[in-house]
């Protein structure tokens, strides 16, 4: 296992996100990841750590008590309203997207360090197998925990949703892409206000930096609201054209990174390696897939969600 761990570490330095056999596949626990696991596809919470308090839009109609409210707002990247290009919101709906780490790409050695593609693919595969084994172990532990510790009836413990329930909730949910980084859940809820009763709104955040990723999920009370909300596809929200599509359910054991869509390859020039948002964004996948060449230009591949 030590050798495998070393290989996995080396795969990180080599890019480890290669196309073909080197591309990572994810085992999806249930219909979506646990809290903070970076699993936008499921009905779970998505590890949104940083929070800040702001007045709700509907509160402006009320008479607030005359007390000063502290303004606690974390620093966050602001995308200019008319920013060209695809912008944020690039995680595929229901995809098991990895969390975007700020700064350098894992073990980026700088310019020119290109390893043997076959070796890289092997290392990536080892790493992939280890990850899957780890996820299986976690899943097994979770099942055992649930079997041993089912709370007595009447106890208001956390509700464990079945896969069927998660899929049903996903059928009442939409994916919203290209969401401005400064947007709040309240603003997003207000934008979809006329579509029906909302059960929950989640703006996905990066697990490491706490910054918003630029996409969100909205769960409605009924499926009809999903259909109504699709009319807001390409509508303007905070000066940006948002993408609204039905949320896709992740099924356990099925790779969500391998969608079988044709791949488009292109080269993109990125120089600001310190910015958490500097990597080239394409369509719905925020992370470059395929061989990541370590020269100045990077060849990436991407999948359109449909």
């Amino acid at each position: 296992m030590a050798a495998a761990a070393a290989a996995a570490a080396a795969a990180g330095a080599a890019g480890g996100r290669g196309s073909g056999p080197g591309r990572r596949r994810h085992l999806v626990p249930g219909a979506g990841g646990e809290a903070g696991e970076g699993a936008p596809g499921g009905a779970g919470d998505y590890g949104n750590g940083l929070e800040s308090e702001e007045l709700e839009p509907e509160e402006l109609l009320l008479e607030p008590e005359p007390e000063p409210e502290p303004e606690e707002e974390p620093p966050r990247p602001r995308a200019p309203p008319g920013a060209p290009g695809p912008g944020p919101g690039s995680g595929a709906p229901g995809s098991q997207e990895e969390e975007e780490e700020p700064g350098l790409v894992e073990g980026d050695p700088g310019d020119g360090a290109i390893e043997d593609p076959e070796l890289e693919a092997i290392k990536a595969r080892v790493r992939e197998m280890e990850e899957e084994a780890e996820k299986l172990k976690e899943l097994q532990n979770e099942v055992e925990k649930q079997m041993n510790m089912s709370p007595p009836p009447g106890n208001a413990g956390p509700v464990i949703m079945s896969i069927e329930e998660k899929m049903e909730a996903d059928a009442r949910s939409i994916y919203v892409g290209n969401v401005d980084y400064g947007a709040t859940a309240e603003e997003l809820e207000a934008h979809f206000h006329g579509c029906g009763s909302v059960n929950r709104v989640t703006i996905l955040c990066d697990k490491f930096s706490g910054h918003p990723k630029g996409f969100a999920y909205i769960e409605f009370s009924d499926k009809e609201s999903v259909r109504t909300s699709l009319a807001l596809d390409e509508s303007l929200f905070r000066g940006r054209q948002i993408k609204v599509i039905p949320k896709r359910t992740n099924r356990p054991g099925i790779s969500t990174t391998d969608r079988g869509f044709p791949r488009a390859r292109y080269r993109a020039r990125t120089t600001n390696y310190n910015s958490s948002r500097s990597r080239f964004y394409s369509g719905f996948n925020s992370r470059p897939r395929g061989r990541v060449y370590r020269g100045r230009a990077r060849a990436t591949s991407w999948y359109s969600p449909y």
Epitope: G36, N48, E51, E53, P70, A185, T202, I203
Partner: nanobody, 115 residues
């Protein structure tokens, strides 16, 4: 994920009182806002009262002076004390939890004011 469970609804006579309670469990945020909304069939949800984690409260004009919202941050609960109830207060009352990145709604509890 955050789960909200409301309780305390029921049938009450005009002029009577009820206390609604909402418990938030799961990954709640230190900085958040909890609110009570109500909905009459065929109408939209209407904001009744809200309270921020720093204790700032707001009320709808129709309930001001009759309803009081209170919150226990340590226990993640928000209560709505409803006094001098009127027939027009009849509705399903929903608890709402909102933070910067997340919003969750409860399933609702029925309040009926009738003689």
């Amino acid at each position: 994920e955050v789960q909200l469970v409301e309780s305390g609804g029921g049938l009450v006579q005009p002029g009577g009182s009820l206390r609604l309670s909402c418990v938030a469990s799961g990954r709640t945020s230190r900085i958040s806002r909890m609110a009570w909304f109500r909905q009459v069939p065929g109408n939209e949800r209407e904001l009744v009262a809200t309270m921020s984690s720093s204790g700032i409260t707001s009320y709808a004009g129709s309930v001001k002076g009759r309803f009081t919202i209170s919150r226990d941050n340590a226990k993640n609960t928000v209560d709505l004390q409803m006094n001098s109830l009127k027939p027009e207060d009849t509705a399903v009352y929903y608890c709402k939890y909102s933070s910067r990145w997340n919003i969750y709604w409860g399933q609702g509890t029925q309040v009926t004011v009738s003689s």
